[in-house]
Interface confidence: medium
C-alpha cells in the first residue's frame, strides 16, 4: 500500500512540475522591467524565451517574437534548449510512469517491468527537473549579470541636462515558476525511485512452491510453479524465497508485500 | 460608435465641490483606462489622472493628488471626477477622455465640461 | 516630471506652406523595449476637445491626412505639415506619453499670415 501511495504521490507530483515547466517555459514574464530607479514609467517592458512584449498606459501589449535564431544570445539559446530537454524528458517519463503505476494492469507484466520502468521513469523525472533549475538558474544568472553592467552606466546624458535611464531587468515570475516546477519534478521523480525498491523482488527466481494435498504435506522443490492434485479449501500455492521446502504449516499465511494484489 | 458625453457647465462658489460625470458608450467601458484633462482659459493642457473601470485602480498627476477624485460607476458606464475645495484657478474646461491606440481601437474624448468657480 | 518644450509658440504661415514645429523633452522617451518613442502630438481647434494626430513620434492616427507627419527620436521631435490647408489652422501640442505623470507642451499655435 505504501509503495502505491508513494508511487502514486510522485507521478502527482512530477505532473504538476511538468505542467509547471512547460508553463514557464511559455511564460513572456521571464525577466521584467526593474522600477525602482524609474516607478512612474507608463511603459512595462517584459521578455520571454521566445518574446519580448510591452505594455503600454493605454493597456495596450505588443509582444514580438525572436525570428531570429542566430542572432541570439547564446545563453538564451543554451536555456531554451534545457527547458525543452526537460520537457521531453518529463513527457517520456509521465508516459513510462503511467504504465509502471501499481495500480494499473497491464496484461501480465511482471512487479520486476514495473519497477524497472518506475526506476526509468523516476530518473527521467530527476533529469527533468534538473535541466529545468539549470536552465532557469542560467537565464537568473544572466540577469544578474547584466543587471549590474546596466547599473554601472544607467544614466547617460549631455552635460547632465538630458537624462536617458537605460531599462534594466529583474526576475520575472516565471523563473520562480520554473524553480518551483523544477523542484517539485525532481521530488517527483525521488518518490518514483524510492517506489522502485519497494516494488523490486529481492530475489526473481523462485526456488521452491509449496502447496497443500489434500491429505498430508509434501514438499516439491521444482523451476516454478506446479499445479497441485488436490483442490481441497485449504489448498494454496506459495512462494518459498529462501531455499528449503516447508510444510503449509510452517509457511505464514499473512500476504507478502511481493503478492501481487 | 463610441461616445464620451460629458455633464453640463457647473458654477461653483470658492470652496464648495463638484462632481462631473462622462457617460461613456458605444464601447466596453470596462475595458479601458478613462483620463482626465484640465485646460484653462488660454492655457495648455494638464493630464489629472486616469482610473480603469474593471479594477477601479488610480493613478494621479500628484498635482491634484488632493484636488481631484476618480471614481465610477460600472452599471452606468460612467466615469467621474470630483473636485474639492474649488478656487478661482480651478476654473477650466475638463475633458474625459479615452485614450487607446497602437491598435484598431482610437482616441476619443469628450466635449469638454466647463467649471467656473467665482465668488 | 518630465519637462515638454515647444517651439515656435506661434508660427504665421500661408496655405500651401511646409510648416515644421519642434518638442523638445527633458528625458528620452524612447523605451529600450520595442525601441519605439512614446510621444504625441495633438490637434486642438477653438471650442474643441484635442484630436490625436501622431503617436509613437511617426506613427499617423487613421484618418489623418498624409501631410502630416512626425519624427525624431529620444528628445528631440518634429511635427510636420508638407502643405498647409485652411483646416490645419489650429494649436499643436505634443505629449510625453513615457513616464507619469503625462506632461504636455505649451503648444505652437498655427495662425494665418
Known amino acids: 500500500m505504501a509503495v502505491t501511495a508513494c508511487q502514486g504521490l510522485g507521478f502527482v507530483v512530477s505532473l504538476i512540475g511538468i505542467a509547471g515547466i512547460i508553463a514557464a517555459t511559455c511564460m513572456d514574464q521571464w525577466s521584467t522591467q526593474d522600477l525602482y530607479n524609474n516607478p512612474v514609467t507608463a511603459v512595462f517592458n517584459y521578455q520571454g524565451l521566445w518574446r519580448s512584449c510591452v505594455r503600454e498606459s493605454s493597456g495596450f501589449t505588443e509582444c514580438r517574437g525572436y525570428f531570429t535564431l542566430l542572432g541570439l544570445p547564446a545563453m538564451l539559446q543554451a536555456v531554451r534548449a534545457l527547458m525543452i530537454v526537460g520537457i521531453v524528458l518529463g513527457a517520456i517519463g509521465l508516459l513510462v510512469s503511467i504504465f509502471a503505476l501499481k495500480c494499473i494492469r497491464i496484461g501480465s507484466m511482471e512487479d520486476s517491468a514495473k519497477a524497472n520502468m518506475t526506476l526509468t521513469s523516476g530518473i527521467m523525472f530527476i533529469v527533468s527537473g534538473l535541466c529545468a533549475i539549470a536552465g532557469v538558474s542560467v537565464f537568473a544568472n544572466m540577469l544578474v549579470t547584466n543587471f549590474w553592467m546596466s547599473t554601472a552606466n544607467m544614466y547617460t546624458g549631455m552635460g547632465g541636462m538630458v537624462q536617458t535611464v537605460q531599462t534594466r531587468y529583474t526576475f520575472g515570475a516565471a523563473l520562480f515558476v520554473g524553480w518551483v516546477a523544477g523542484g517539485l519534478t525532481l521530488i517527483g521523480g525521488v518518490m518514483m525511485c524510492i517506489a522502485c525498491r519497494g516494488l523490486a523482488p529481492e530475489e526473481t527466481n523462485y526456488k521452491a512452491v509449496s502447496y497443500h494435498a489434500s491429505g498430508h504435506s509434501v514438499a516439491y522443490k521444482p523451476g516454478g510453479f506446479k499445479a497441485s492434485t488436490g483442490f481441497g479449501s485449504n489448498t494454496k500455492n506459495k512462494k518459498i524465497y529462501d531455499g528449503g521446502a516447508r510444510t503449509e504449516d510452517e509457511v505464514q499465511s499473512y500476504p507478502s508485500k511481493h503478492d501481487y494484489v | 460608435q463610441v461616445q464620451l458625453v460629458q455633464s453640463g457647465a457647473e458654477v461653483k462658489k470658492p470652496g464648495a465641490s463638484v462632481k462631473l460625470s462622462c457617460k461613456a458608450s458605444?464601447?466596453?467601458?470596462?475595458?479601458?483606462?478613462m483620463h482626465w484633462v484640465r485646460q484653462r482659459p488660454g492655457q495648455g493642457l494638464e493630464w489629472i489622472g486616469m482610473i480603469h473601470p474593471n479594477s477601479g485602480s488610480t493613478n494621479y498627476n500628484e498635482k491634484f493628488k488632493s484636488k481631484a477624485t476618480l471614481t465610477v460607476d460600472k452599471s452606468t458606464s460612467t466615469a467621474y471626477m470630483e473636485l474639492s475645495s474649488l478656487r478661482s484657478e480651478d476654473t477650466a474646461v475638463y475633458y474625459c477622455?479615452?485614450?487607446?491606440?497602437?491598435?484598431?481601437?482610437?482616441?476619443?474624448w469628450g466635449q469638454g465640461t466647463t467649471v467656473t468657480v467665482s465668488s | 516630471d518630465i519637462v515638454m518644450t515647444q517651439s515656435p509658440s506661434s508660427l504665421s504661415v500661408s496655405v500651401g506652406d511646409r510648416v515644421t514645429m519642434t518638442c523638445k523633452s527633458s528625458q528620452s522617451l524612447l523605451n529600450s523595449g520595442n525601441q519605439k518613442n512614446y510621444l504625441t502630438w495633438y490637434q486642438q481647434k477653438p471650442g474643441q476637445p484635442p484630436k490625436l494626430l501622431i503617436y509613437w513620434a511617426s506613427t499617423r492616427e487613421s484618418g489623418v491626412p498624409d501631410r502630416f507627419s512626425g519624427s525624431g527620436s529620444g528628445t528631440d521631435f518634429t511635427l510636420t505639415i508638407s502643405s498647409v490647408q485652411p483646416e490645419d489652422f489650429a494649436t499643436y501640442y505634443c505629449?510625453?506619453?513615457?513616464?507619469?505623470?503625462?506632461?504636455f507642451g505649451g503648444g505652437t499655435k498655427l495662425e494665418i499670415k
Open positions: 477622455a479615452r485614450r487607446y491606440y497602437g491598435s484598431i481601437s482610437p482616441d476619443y
Open positions: 458605444g464601447y466596453t467601458f470596462t475595458s479601458y483606462w
Open positions: 505629449q510625453n506619453d513615457y513616464s507619469y505623470p503625462f506632461t
